[in-house]
Interface confidence: low
């Protein structure tokens, strides 16, 4: 059952599993979700009854039934951790707290002109996990205005005290505001010989590097395979750390595999969904419960739905056994992961997908996409939405895309004219314009929000967002998909589809199918050749074929131009601009959607 | 205000070359395809050539391809036209003009149509 | 190349009536024609594009229809300024070619 209220004066008793410093009930809460156990916790807030060394305390908790006892105690708040919940959940905290010194190991001291600079240089700094900065108002004359980056090994502060005059908050990664790289290769045969902050097992390596990517101080990593010589170090996940970021030695060894940590990009990655299947392979943990289930994709469900299970293993019926079904072993650990592996024995493992909400919904993998052929089918752009505009008579006004379940984004040259955001209707999960009557369902729109720096689509800024007047649940034929990623600024995306009902031709009509074209990006130098009475700024991206004939139209603008990267569909461009349609030499001018993820992040994230 | 000023028209014996030139002025020359149109005496219009923007496509009709060349310098806001190998045929006036375009996001379209004339420069080709 | 026949050639109406001008494209233009009127001794001027799309600037009494391959050119409510030679143009691709022209005077 999903409990969301925080009980006041409240202290849940017994089941303690660890206790960390939060500088609020609400984020003690995240850091419970975030646990691999914890599934209730009792926090102290400051208080006069209260010894001050209890203030700020966490007490992660857990419990076979899911609740503990409750006893009244002043200053106590308690709750229930969100993995008893289905909505969507973020680790992202943007708040920053006032006479508040939250400790931790200081490894970095400089001067900052605000709180706001000293927490973007927590978040550029691949160490930092939270800041305190002395306001100018601090007694200290020489500790004024200083910027104080910490990190500690769980990620959350030692202590918190009470300090006045200084501000506290934490970095703003998982917040997908990180300038720093995503470096996603995997490298085989290699190994980071730099010092280990924990080990787990795992099935390989790219759990291994999900592992390390939600790890408080795991920046790189290093996994031995099955095949590694070494029996007793098989499917183990090494997570390491250096002072410099970066691995200091890299040694050549076979059935070896390493890589980085994605922060910088987890984002638009799945780092806690583990839904692969594991064949001939069994996980060992501690036994939750053993039931009959049809198959793996059963045991997975279950494991789904039992609040406590992390990971499973599924052995098949032996032939006309127990009606056809398995067992469904359900299991857990202390820190998430099966405290051995082993291989051979015909068993099928996986993980619990109760945690692939802890990831953005813009990672779901989609159904695989009809190649070739210009219409598309039903589902294969579920992020896509027709945008309507009633007046003077309802029609097709622009596309968009959906990035949240509240938010489109668009262009603003689409909104030339509307006057008021009560003439626009969103349609989503529609292939063909024709099913569109006046019983279909809608979002209204409760706010357009246009770049101020927009003046017409050519000098770019094109772009907006639309904020709905009720959310989007998210089906296979709606949901949202993935900005790309600061740290992604130099991939090379060769993937790319723009999609819309716009125009086939220069001189046609909106089309009644979604329709799709494959269409090459091309460098802003090129680009810029084919349009020389235009400046095309690094904030415009553009695509095209050299010899024409392939292009987003008239009624595509507002769209998206989605590239796929790692599995992940990415909205890399908004359809702006272009001479004519489909030109030789004239490529279509998107609206770089990487370059304003921050003011996407800020808009849709104003409190 | 828009303004399209011809210059370099005259008589000129059959065979021979004539240069027509263009100043342009009152809008931003480099976004604009540019076009000659010719209208000979009492007759109707003829399209003679066009170039884009940024001077890198020329179009010719088969009347007029091999002995006209259309050019551009968007630097001095000047439009061309040399004339080579003239014929009795050729003598019209000629008028420099502008490509219109929308400017508005994919409503930002090319359009083969002119918004804006010159008041022209009447070539006679006789001997 | 697209070949563009106007009718009449020429047309004599009073001042106050309408006039309607043809338009006939040899294949399917898809509504890229544009009207231009050219008064005695002075360059054309665009009136009308995309078959009905006004020109900023041109009086409401000119009106565009037409779709495929035959479209006309409505003036209502005729007046003196009128007088002039209207052309059509059809710009489905950028070999644009002209009609013959048709001639306004007033009765």
């Known amino acids: 059952e999903c409990v969301t209220q925080l009980l006041k004066d409240t202290c849940f008793e017994g089941g303690d599993i660890t206790t960390v410093f939060t500088p609020s009930a609400k984020y003690c809460q995240v850091v419970c979700t975030y646990h691999p156990r914890c599934l209730l916790f009792t926090f102290t807030a400051e208080s006069p009854s209260e010894d001050p060394t209890r203030w700020f305390t966490c007490v992660l908790k857990d419990s076979v039934t899911e609740t503990l006892p409750r006893v009244n105690r002043t200053a106590a708040i308690s709750g229930y951790s969100f993995k008893q919940c289905s909505h969507q959940i973020s680790a992202c905290n943007k708040d920053i707290y006032v006479d508040l010194d939250m400790k931790g190991i200081n490894y970095n001291s400089s001067v900052a002109k605000s709180a706001q600079e000293c927490q973007e240089r927590c978040t550029d700094d691949v160490h930092c996990h939270f800041f305190t900065y002395a306001t100018r108002q601090f007694p200290s004359l020489e500790h004024r205005n200083i910027c104080l980056l910490k990190h500690t090994q769980t990620g959350t502060p030692t202590r918190i005290t009470k300090l006045d005059k200084v501000v506290s908050g934490f970095s703003l990664k998982s917040c997908a505001l990180s300038n720093l790289a995503c470096i996603r290769d995997i490298f085989p045969n290699t190994v980071f010989a730099d010092s280990n902050i924990d080990s787990v097992m795992a099935p390989d390596a790219f759990v291994c590097g999900r592992i390390c990517t939600h790890h408080p101080g795991c920046l790189f990593f290093t996994f031995f395979s099955q095949e590694w010589p070494k029996e007793s170090q098989r499917n183990l996940c090494l997570l390491k750390t250096s002072e410099s970021g970066l691995p200091s030695t890299r040694i050549k060894k076979s059935k070896a595999l390493s890589g980085f940590s994605l922060q910088s990009c987890r984002h638009s990655i799945p780092v806690f969904c583990h839904s692969s299947f594991y064949h001939d392979t069994d996980f060992l943990g501690e036994e939750l419960d053993i039931v009959a289930a049809k198959s793996h994709e059963a045991c997975q469900k279950l494991c789904t739905n039992a609040v406590r299970c992390q990971f499973f293993t599924y052995t098949p019926a032996q032939a006309s056994c127990n009606e056809g079904k398995g067992k469904c072993y359900l299991k857990l650990s202390s820190n998430g992961s099966p405290t051995k592996i082993l291989h051979g024995r015909g068993g099928i493992s996986g993980y619990t997908l109760r945690l692939c909400k802890m990831d953005n919904e813009c990672t779901t993998k989609i159904k695989p996409r009809i190649v070739g052929g210009t219409a598309s089918v039903r589902g294969e752009w579920p992020w896509q939405v027709t945008l309507h505009t009633t007046s003077p008579t309802q029609r097709h006004l622009c596309g968009g895309s959906i990035i949240g379940n509240q938010w489109i984004l668009t262009a603003a040259h689409c909104f030339y004219g509307v006057e008021s955001p009560k003439i626009l209707r969103v349609y989503s999960g529609i292939l063909n314009q024709s099913e569109i009557k006046e019983d279909t369902s809608f979002f209204g729109v409760q706010e357009i929000i246009i770049h101020d720096q927009y003046k017409m689509a050519e000098s770019g800024y094109d772009i907006a967002l639309l904020k709905l007047e009720t959310t989007v649940n998210y089906t296979d034929s709606q949901r949202p998909i993935c900005l790309p990623s600061k740290g992604d600024r130099n991939v090379i995306y060769t993937d790319c589809w723009v999609t819309g009902w716009g125009y086939r031709k220069l001189r046609d009509k909106i089309q009644n199918t979604l329709q799709k074209a494959k269409i090459p990006l091309v460098t802003n130098e090129e680009c810029q050749k084919r349009y020389r009475g235009h400046k095309i700024t690094h904030k415009m991206i553009c695509a095209g074929y050299r010899e024409g004939g392939k292009d987003a139209c008239k009624g595509d603008s507002g769209g998206p131009l989605s590239c796929k990267h790692n599995e992940v569909w990415h909205l890399v461009g908004i359809t702006s601009w272009g001479e004519g349609c489909a030109q030789r030499e004239r490529p279509g001018v998107y609206t770089n959607v990487v370059e304003y993820v921050d003011w996407i992040l800020e808009k849709t994230q104003a409190v | 205000e828009v303004q399209l000023v011809e210059s370099g028209g005259g008589l000129v014996q059959p065979g021979r070359s004539l240069k027509l030139s263009c100043v342009a002025s009152g809008f931003t020359f480099n976004n604009h395809w540019m076009t000659w149109i010719r209208q000979a005496p009492g007759k109707g219009l003829e399209w003679v050539a066009s170039?884009?923007?940024?001077?890198?496509?020329?179009y010719y009709p088969d009347s007029v391809k091999g002995r006209f060349t259309i050019s551009r310098d968007n630097a001095k806001s000047t439009l061309y036209l040399h004339m080579n190998s003239l014929r009795s045929e050729d003598t019209a006036t000629y008028y420099c003009?502008?490509?219109?375009?929308?400017?508005?996001?994919?409503?930002?379209?090319?359009?083969?149509?002119?918004?804006?004339w010159g008041q022209g420069a009447s070539v006679t080709v006789s001997s | 190349d697209v070949r563009m026949t106007q009718s009449p050639a020429s047309l004599s109406a009073s001042l106050g009536e309408t006039v309607n001008i043809e338009c006939l494209a040899s294949?399917?233009?898809?509504?890229?024609l544009a009207w231009y009127q050219q008064k005695p001794g002075k360059s054309p001027q665009l009136l009308i594009y995309n078959a009905n799309s006004l020109q900023n600037g041109v009086p409401s009494r000119f009106s565009g229809s037409g779709s495929g391959t035959q479209y006309s050119l409505k003036i209502s409510t005729l007046q003196s300024e009128d007088v002039a030679t209207y052309f059509c143009q059809q710009y489905s691709n950028y070999r644009r070619t002209f009609g013959g022209g048709t001639k306004l005077e007033i009765n």
């Open positions: 294949e399917d233009i898809y509504s890229d």
């Open positions: 003009t502008r490509d219109r375009y929308d400017s508005d996001g994919y409503y930002y379209v090319r359009y083969y149509v002119v918004d804006a």
């Open positions: 170039i884009t923007d940024n001077g890198g496509s020329t």
